[in-house]
């Protein structure tokens, strides 16, 4: 931004500048250019020997300026366009200035003035241009400063040129008030802080409803000596509930929200939320819908899922395979997991209780992501009820549960009762029994044994009878032995695991049961 302190052309001849000597040399004249009257100070004493004609401006108040720019528009006639070349003719003039705290009026003293420069034209007006009224306008600019007094004068010294001053404009530069990155920077005088620091650092203030981002830098700009803003640093962002519209922050419209200070616009309230008011930072969930703590505010509100679909329990001897399908209503979420709980009831007494401790699951029964699980080690003659609950990220926000149950009765054989009949250093003779009523259902018995402490290998023997001798064993070694009935339906209940020890080579005949 240029702040004009003096503009001769704009004053349309109303500025009465001082000429010295009075009535000679410089002269205010009017001409017509482009059908418009223009005023100029001119002098053309090119055949009268040495000249020293001065033209001094009126006193110019400095205002806040430290450095001023002087723009001159002028025309100079070619000395060769005059007869005989006008021997004393010159084609330059001199520019001076003087600072003062008061206006000296008509008191003009050359010695008070300091020369700024000799002003020479880039283009002179030759005869043909003069006759055709082609004004060869030259533009020259000079900078003066730093200025310290209240005001100043400019002066033009003619030394024998044919020159016309059409425009004298004196101005200083300001970096204009500016909005940048939602920060307001004040109008700033363009000054060099020092020769090594030609930029003035100016702090901006965030516009209404804008803030400096957390951990970010406040807005800064640099004002150059040329009155231009450079190198923005930092920024302001519209605060929560407001979005950037041109150079301002505007409240989010009803039905929209913005949860944090950011560059992003307000977002439409997601599904299953209540319509927000103006300037909302979030949108409340509809009744029955919820947001998990980790859910972004831009996500739709969701609800717990419905119960799993089509739960089936398929009995396979002492095992049950549970299968189900995903809930019809996921609640709008993908993070569904399943939990399986088990209850067993004794048919004789009708007594029931949890059975988590006595059964084995093919994978941990809580936070299942698959839709099937196998439960083994079920006891015979027992009624089991399995509940499969579907849960998602918002299930913990409600007390109700979404589950489906399936019951199954275990009719498989009781576990065989096993005992050690005999033993030696290399063999163990094992016998077992089951109730007579169940014997018809047994197809074979499966005896599994291994050295205690050796989890990597085991041996299996099948037999139709109620006893087996396990040979080729190591002396003085404890073996883990389990007997399980095999029925048409699959595996029956297994006996508990027994520990039997072979005799040592010098050992006694004591037996461990």
């Amino acid at each position: 931004k240029e702040v004009v302190l003096l503009d001769f052309a704009a004053m349309k001849g109303e500025l009465g500048w001082l000429t010295h000597p009075y009535g000679k040399g410089w002269d205010l004249m009017q001409n017509i250019m482009d059908d418009m009257p223009i005023y100029m100070y001119s002098v053309c004493n090119v055949v009268s020997g040495d000249q020293d004609n001065w033209l001094r401006t009126n006193w110019v108040y400095r205002e806040e300026a430290e450095r001023i720019f002087i723009e001159l528009k002028f025309t100079v006639r070619d000395c060769n366009s005059f007869p005989g070349g006008a021997s004393s003719c010159k084609e330059t003039f001199n520019l001076y200035y003087a600072e003062s705290d008061v206006d000296y009026g008509t008191n003009f003293q050359k010695r008070q003035f300091t020369k700024i420069d000799t002003i020479a034209p880039d283009e002179i007006t030759v005869s043909s241009d003069f006759e055709a009224r082609n004004v060869k306008l030259n533009v020259e600019e000079r900078m003066v400063g730093p200025l310290t007094r209240k005001g100043f004068y400019l002066a033009f010294q003619d030394i024998g040129a044919c020159v016309a001053l059409l425009s004298v404009r004196v101005y200083y530069k300001k970096c204009p008030e500016m909005l940048q990155s939602l920060a307001r920077f004040p109008e700033t005088i363009a000054v060099a802080v020092s020769d090594t620091q030609p930029l003035a650092t100016v702090a901006g203030t965030c516009v209404d409803h804008a803030v400096v981002p957390y951990g970010g830098e406040g807005p800064l700009m640099h004002c150059t000596v040329d009155g231009e803003w450079l190198v923005p640093i930092g920024q302001c962002l519209c605060q929560e509930g407001y979005e950037k519209v041109e150079d301002a922050c505007r409240a989010c419209s009803p039905g929209f929200f913005k949860s944090e200070a950011s560059e992003s616009p307000c977002l439409e309230c997601p599904e299953h939320t209540l319509p927000s008011t103006e300037g909302a930072t979030s949108c409340q969930c509809e009744e029955g819908y919820f947001r998990a703590p980790e859910d972004p505010l831009s996500m739709s509100c969701t609800r717990p899922p419905s119960a799993p679909n089509y739960l089936t329990a398929i009995g396979m001897g002492a095992k049950v395979e549970l299968r189900w399908t995903a809930p019809k209503d996921t609640g709008g979420r993908q993070d569904i997991v399943y939990s399986v709980t088990c209850e067993q009831c004794w048919p004789e007494s009708g007594e029931c209780g949890p059975c988590e401790a006595s059964v084995r699951y093919s994978e941990p029964p809580h936070a299942l992501t698959r839709t099937s699980v196998t439960v083994s080690d079920l006891e015979p003659h027992m009624n089991y009820t399995f509940a499969v609950e579907a849960r998602n990220g918002v299930s913990g926000l409600v007390t109700s549960r979404s589950f489906r149950t399936a019951s199954v009765s275990i009719n498989q054989t009781e576990p065989p009762k096993v005992r050690l009949e005999d033993r030696s250093t290399t063999s163990l003779s094992v016998t077992w029994s089951i109730p007579v009523s169940q014997q018809s259902r047994v197809w074979k018995y499966e005896v599994t044994y291994r050295k205690k402490g050796d989890a990597n290998s085991y041996n299996v023997r099948r037999t139709e009878g109620f006893s087996v001798t396990l040979d080729d064993l190591a002396p003085d070694t404890t073996y883990l032995v389990q007997v399980q009935a095999l029925t048409q339906e699959g595996q029956g209940a297994g006996s508990k695991v027994h520990e039997f020890q072979t005799l040592s080579t010098e050992g006694s005949a004591n037996m461990a049961v």
Epitope: D27, M29, Q30, N31, I32, P37, M40, S42, V43, C44, N45, V46, V47, T75, V76, R77, S81, F82, P83, S127, S128, F130, E131, A132, R133, V135, C162, V163, A164
Partner: antibody, heavy 128, light 107 residues
């Protein structure tokens, strides 16, 4: 020394035509703006027409516009005024006048010109 | 067109007198004004241009002043050769109009 010598004047009937000539010497004719100025008997001066150093532009007074034509031949150092449809009010002494910008000690040319050099004039009489 | 009005139309003076002739323009012509001298049966002669600039070879007793609409031609000390008719001419517009003339005669 600058010399301008007009010729071609005389008596002519209204509606008739006449061609005036102005022979120039003692200066560089092609540098000069040239003009015709007339003076009716016992009256003041009236500018008639002008022509630029190279033959253009040309200007005319409203009273002669469309009837008179100014021209020049720089190779012959001669200025002309072709006068058609002459009227009684055109009766006057016609002066050839010249202007050289080199003698105009001003920084910017005036909107028009004045006349530095004059011929002795030639009389044109329009009468029936 | 710009009208130029001279006053007086006739002026009687004696040798050695200071003589002033006035020329008024119907609108501002800045300083674009010339003064001419004409003797009977002769061509006009240029005296002054741009209101105050003396033409080459013109005696310094002649001077011109003024700007805008009011102009004067001054003969500081009238000489026998100066008895003639004087015309002003504006060249601020293409019409280049002359004043009606001021006749300076012997008193």
């Amino acid at each position: 020394e600058v010399q301008l010598l007009e010729s071609g004047g005389g008596l002519v009937q209204p509606g008739g035509s006449l061609r005036l000539s102005c022979a120039a010497s003692g200066f560089t004719f092609s540098h000069y703006m040239m003009a015709w100025v007339r003076q009716a008997p016992g009256k003041g001066l009236e500018w008639v027409s002008r022509i630029g150093p190279s033959g253009g532009p040309t200007h005319y007074a409203d009273s002669v516009k469309g009837r008179f034509t100014i021209s020049r031949d720089n190779s012959k150092n001669t200025l002309y005024l072709q006068m058609n449809s002459l009227r009684a009010e055109d009766t006057a002494v016609y002066y050839c006048a010249g202007y050289d910008s080199g003698y105009d000690y001003v920084a910017v040319a005036g909107p028009a010109e004045y006349f530095q050099h004059w011929g002795q004039g030639t009389l044109v009489t329009v009468s029936s | 067109d710009i009208q130029m009005t001279q006053s007086p139309s006739t002026l009687s003076a004696s040798v050695g007198d200071r003589v002033t002739i006035t020329c008024r323009a119907s609108q501002s012509i800045s300083t674009w004004l010339a003064w001419y001298q004409q003797k009977p049966g002769k061509a006009p002669k240029l005296l002054i241009y741009k209101a105050s600039n003396l033409h080459t070879g013109v005696p310094s007793r002649f001077s011109g002043s003024g700007s805008g609409t009011e102009f004067t031609l001054t003969i500081s000390s009238l000489q026998p050769d100066d008895f003639a008719t004087y015309y002003c001419q504006q060249y601020n517009s293409y019409s280049r109009t002359f004043g009606q003339g001021t006749k300076v005669e012997i008193k």
